[in-house]
């Protein structure tokens, strides 16, 4: 009887299954859709929460202007196809034989066409712009405040390494994140600025991935920041690729 | 990138044996801990050996005494001899590479997978 076989749960991932017969009497915690047994002592993959998200029961100025290369994720939930690794793969198809390449957090970024579609290599999303508008307060938070608390939260909530949130914008009411990770910055054990973003994302829009926890509770100098809209912008190290139809559409 | 490639699966009859083996590239090998994982038709994955970089093994009661899981770090290649196959050992056979924590078991990547039917 170990201390695994107590407390045999993925604290960062609700969307697992653990049972205590791993290796040694080691806890395993197997993501739904996938089956793959995650690591609970950090995040999970975006590719791999989609994939169990898919397969769960369905019932349940400082500002900056985003380039004209960034990317909204219009399209939706879609079941993926991950990697080895559990990572996107760069060319993702639904059950009709639609293709589509992806960035590395699974948003498209290329025009949809058949199985002949050919995506190379997974481009790398290295700028991550997290766009927010909180609900009126009786005044402006203080911007150094509100800055501390915000990498506070992704360094702690989310094991997200202080170097990688870049910047906080604050322009009363909307707030601006900014997170960046190129690949050579990126070191082994290193959480992926993607996967912060989105469960961060989960978080804002009150479907918190961790196990346990209550909801995300955000307060500056304890006046609650309640967020009312979300907008995420991701730009890829190699600019996407769009037809000018869908460009002027 | 990771890439873990299996092969020798098949068709064998109950009593029978075989050897799973699985190619590994893209990471330091002599270094990982490794594992056999198989998912039969719709049941969920469970692992059914487990080896460290130094050689030590771990097994669940269901193959113990049958599976033998072992590696060759200078071909970079991790293996699994099945002997007294059963009907029920039938199902996907992938292998993993691993690790264990303090409390838990992760696989941080694996294979595609191969086919083990064990009929008569």
């Known amino acids: 009887h170990t201390a695994a076989q107590d407390n045999c749960t993925c604290p960062t991932n609700k969307m697992t299954v653990c049972s205590p017969d791993g290796p040694g009497g080691r806890c395993q915690c197997r993501a739904l859709g996938s089956g793959m047994a995650v690591d609970c002592s950090t995040l999970t993959s975006k590719c791999l929460l989609l994939k169990a998200r898919m397969s769960a029961p369905k019932n349940a100025r400082t500002l900056v202007r985003p380039s004209e290369h960034a990317l909204v994720d219009n399209d939706g939930l879609y079941d993926p196809d991950c990697d080895p690794e559990g990572r996107f793969k760069a060319r993702q198809c639904n059950q009709t034989s639609v293709c589509w390449c992806v960035n590395s957090v699974g948003v498209r970024r290329t025009d949809k066409g058949d199985l002949s579609l050919r995506c190379d290599e997974l481009v790398r999303t290295h700028h991550i712009l997290i766009d927010l508008r909180h609900r009126p307060t009786a005044g402006a938070f203080n911007h150094s405040d509100l800055d501390a608390e915000l990498r506070r939260l992704f360094r702690e909530r989310y094991r997200l390494h202080p170097k990688f949130v870049a910047a906080v914008h604050y322009e009363q009411p909307t707030i601006q994140i900014e997170l960046r990770q190129n690949t050579s910055q990126k070191a082994a054990g290193d959480v992926d600025i993607g996967d912060a973003a989105y469960y961060f994302e989960r978080d804002i829009k009150g479907e918190s991935l961790f196990q346990g926890r209550g909801g995300l509770d955000l307060r500056v100098r304890g006046e609650p920041l309640q967020v009312e809209r979300t907008l995420i912008y991701y730009l890829d190290e190699i600019p996407p690729k769009f037809s000018m139809k869908r460009l002027t559409a | 990138q990771v890439q873990l490639q299996e092969s020798g699966g098949g068709l064998v009859q109950p009593g029978g044996s075989l050897r799973l083996s699985c190619a590994a590239s893209?990471?330091?090998?002599?270094?990982?801990?490794m594992s056999w994982v198989r998912q039969a038709p719709g049941k969920g994955p469970e692992w059914v050996s487990y080896?460290?970089?130094?050689?030590?093994?771990y097994y669940p009661d269901t193959v113990k005494g049958r599976f033998t899981i072992s590696r060759d770090n200078s071909k970079n290649t991790l293996y699994l001899q099945m002997n007294s196959l059963r009907a029920e050992d039938t199902a996907v056979y992938r292998c993993?590479?691993?690790?264990?924590?303090?409390?838990?078991?992760?696989?941080?990547?694996w294979g595609q997978g191969t086919q083990v039917t064990v009929s008569s």
């Open positions: 993993a590479k691993s690790r264990l924590t303090d409390s838990h078991y992760v696989e941080d990547a």
């Open positions: 080896i460290t970089s130094g050689g030590t093994t």
């Open positions: 893209g990471f330091t090998f002599s270094g990982s801990d």
